[in-house]
C-alpha cells in the first residue's frame, strides 16, 4: 500500500504522458488524479511505466471505482488489464462487444489467461447465450474456445452460431461435447444441399448417430479417413462393410492401416470375415463364416 | 550493482528435464520483469520467455510453449527455467536478462549457463 | 509473432568508417526497438532503447533512428572495441523477437 503523501510543488499532472514514467511510485500516487487517468487512459499503452508504476496506476483506479470499473474505461486498460486479478474483473459488468475484442486483443497470440478466462465467462453469462458475433470474437481469438466449454455451457449455443465455427475450432473438442454440437450443426446445415452440407457437417461428425452415418453413406460423400476415426464407436458398430465402402468411397483402402484403432478395430470384430473380403484390403479378424452372432442387447431390450 | 547469475546447465539426454535458476542482486528483484533469451552455438539470440514481477503474467516463444516453464521466488530473488521434453535443438546458452516494464528492454543481462541436450 | 529481420547478416568495415545496420519488423511496433552488441563467449549489451535514445554509458557515436517497420543503427566513427555482432529486437509485443544479428568484421 502507497503511503499517502503530499504532491510536491510543480508536479501535479496536468495530463497522462511521457514525463511521469520519470515519477517515483509516492509521486504517481500523490500527483496523478485518478479522475484524470480514468479519462486518459488510452494514453497509458504508448507510456513504457514500469510494472511498480502500473499497480499504482491500477490502486488508483481501484479507490475511484471499488465496485468495479465503468465500461468507458475498462475499454481503453490496455496493457493495465493484464495487472487486473480475476477478482477484480468479477466485479466488471462488460456488455460491448467492442469492449471485449480491445482486451482479447492486449492477449493476442498467447494462451489463454485467468483474466481472460474470468472476462469471457462475465461477457458471455451477461448476454445470456453464445451468439454468432461473440462466438466468432472468441474462436478468431482462441480457435480452442469452443472446447473449454462443458457440454452444458454449449447447451446454450444457438445453431445459428455453428456457421461461425471452423474444424480446427473443433479440434480439441471430445466426444462429450460433439454430442451436445452435432445436433445445432445438422439442424443450422439442414437447407443446404448433399455435398455442401457434408464439407460443413463434416467437423461435427464425432458426435452423429450411427442413423446419420447410414444417411450419408447414400450420398457419395467420400469421408476421409481422419473423419473417419473421430466418429464415436458406438455409432460406426452397426455399420454394415458395404454401408462403410459406400461411405469412405476410395478412402477405403486407409482402413488397412488403421486395422488396429478404435473405431476400426472394433468395427471389424462386429463385421463377418467374408464381407471383410470381398472389401480386398486383407483385414482380419472378422466373425468365421459359420457362426451365428446373436445380438444380445436387442434380447434384452425384447425381455 | 545490478548482478545476474545463472546456473544448472549441464549435459542432458533428449527426452529428460533440466532446471536453470538465475539469482538476482544489486536491485528490487519483486520490482521488475525477468526474461530467459537462449543463443545456440555459433547462432543467434532468441528471446525464450518473459514473467511479469509479481508472477502474474507469462509468456513463451512458441518453440518451446508446452515444455518449458518459467518460474520466480521473490522471496529468494531468483528466476527458474523448468525444461522438460528436451531436444537436441534446445542445445544453447540460456541467459537470464531484466526488464522493467512491458514496455522495456533487456537493459542488464546475467552471463549465462551452457544447456547441452545430446545422447 | 512479430518477424525481425536484419540486413546486412555480415559487414566489412575499418576503422573510423560510418557503418549503417538496417533492421525491419514484419508489423508496425511504433518506436519499441532495442540494439544490443555481443562480443564472442560474452552476455549482450544493451545500446539503444526505444529505437533512438542512448542507454546511459554507451558511446554517443551509436546512434538509432525510425519508427513502425524501418529502423537503422549508426555507428559514426568505428572503433576497434566497436568489431562485434549487433543485434535488434522489438519489445511491442510479449514475445520479443530478435533479429538474426549482423556481424561488423575488420575489412
Known amino acids: 500500500e502507497v503511503e499517502k503523501t503530499a504532491c510536491p510543488s510543480g508536479k501535479k499532472a496536468r495530463e497522462i504522458d511521457e514525463s511521469l514514467i520519470f515519477y517515483k511510485k509516492w509521486e504517481l500516487e500523490a500527483c496523478v488524479d485518478a479522475a484524470l487517468l480514468a479519462t486518459q487512459m488510452d494514453r497509458v499503452n504508448a507510456i513504457p511505466f514500469t510494472y511498480e508504476q502500473l499497480d499504482v496506476l491500477k490502486h488508483k483506479l481501484d479507490e475511484l471505482y471499488p465496485q468495479g470499473y465503468p465500461e468507458s474505461v475498462i475499454q481503453h486498460l490496455g496493457y493495465l488489464f493484464l495487472k487486473m486479478s480475476p477478482e477484480d474483473i468479477r466485479k466488471w459488468n462488460v456488455t460491448s462487444l467492442e469492449t471485449l475484442k480491445a482486451l482479447l486483443e492486449v492477449n493476442k497470440g498467447h494462451e489463454m489467461s485467468p483474466q481472460v478466462a474470468t472476462l469471457i465467462d462475465r461477457f458471455v453469462k451477461g448476454r445470456g447465450q453464445l451468439d454468432k458475433d461473440t462466438l466468432d470474437t472468441l474462436t478468431a481469438f482462441y480457435p480452442g474456445y469452443l472446447c473449454s466449454l462443458s457440454p452444458e455451457e454449449l447447451s446454450s449455443v444457438p445453431p445459428s452460431s455453428i456457421w461461425a465455427v471452423r474444424p480446427q475450432d473443433l479440434d480439441t473438442c471430445d466426444p462429450r461435447q460433439l454430442d451436445v454440437l452435432y445436433p445445432k450443426a445438422r439442424l443450422a446445415f439442414q437447407n443446404m444441399n448433399g455435398s455442401e452440407y457434408f464439407v460443413k457437417i463434416q467437423s461435427f461428425l464425432g458426435g452423429a448417430p450411427t442413423e446419420d452415418l447410414k444417411a450419408l453413406s447414400q450420398q457419395n460423400v467420400s469421408m476421409d479417413l481422419a473423419t473417419f476415426m473421430k466418429l464415436r464407436t458406438d455409432a460406426v458398430l452397426p455399420l454394415t462393410v458395404a454401408e462403410v465402402q459406400k461411405l469412405l468411397g476410395p478412402h477405403v483402402e486407409g482402413l488397412k492401416a488403421e486395422e488396429r484403432h478404435r473405431p476400426v478395430r472394433d468395427w471389424i470384430l462386429r463385421q463377418r470375415q467374408d464381407d471383410l473380403d470381398t472389401l480386398g484390403l486383407g483385414l482380419q479378424g472378422g466373425i468365421p463364416n459359420g457362426y451365428l452372432v446373436l445380438d444380445l442387447s436387442m434380447q434384452e431390450a425384447l425381455s | 550493482q545490478v548482478q545476474l547469475v545463472e546456473s544448472g546447465g549441464g549435459v542432458v539426454q533428449p527426452g529428460r528435464s533440466l532446471r536453470l535458476s538465475c539469482a538476482a542482486s544489486?536491485?528490487?528483484?519483486?520490482?521488475?520483469?525477468m526474461n530467459w533469451v537462449r543463443q545456440a552455438p555459433g547462432k543467434g539470440l532468441e528471446w525464450v520467455a518473459v514473467?511479469?514481477?509479481?508472477?502474474?503474467?507469462?509468456y513463451y516463444a512458441d518453440s518451446v510453449k508446452g515444455r518449458f516453464t518459467i518460474s520466480r521466488d521473490n522471496s529468494k530473488n531468483t528466476l527458474y527455467l523448468q525444461m522438460n521434453s528436451l531436444r537436441a535443438e534446445d542445445t544453447a546458452v540460456y541467459y537470464c536478462a531484466r526488464d522493467r516494464g512491458p514496455l522495456w528492454p533487456l537493459d542488464y543481462w546475467g552471463q549465462g549457463t551452457l544447456v547441452t541436450v545430446s545422447s | 509473432d512479430i518477424q525481425m529481420t536484419q540486413s546486412p547478416s555480415t559487414l566489412s568495415a575499418s576503422v573510423g568508417d560510418r557503418v549503417t545496420i538496417t533492421c525491419r519488423a514484419s508489423q508496425s511496433i511504433s518506436r519499441w526497438l532495442a540494439w544490443y552488441q555481443q562480443k564472442p563467449g560474452k552476455a549482450p549489451k544493451l545500446l539503444i532503447y526505444?529505437?533512438?535514445s542512448l542507454e546511459s554509458g554507451v558511446p554517443s557515436r551509436f546512434s538509432g533512428s525510425g519508427s513502425g517497420t524501418e529502423f537503422t543503427l549508426t555507428i559514426s566513427n568505428l572503433q576497434p572495441d566497436d568489431f562485434a555482432t549487433f543485434y535488434c529486437q522489438q519489445y511491442a509485443s510479449y514475445s520479443r523477437t530478435f533479429g538474426q544479428g549482423t556481424k561488423v568484421e575488420i575489412k
Open positions: 514473467i511479469w514481477n509479481d508472477g502474474s503474467n507469462k
Open positions: 526505444k529505437a533512438s
Open positions: 544489486g536491485f528490487t528483484f519483486s520490482s521488475d520483469g
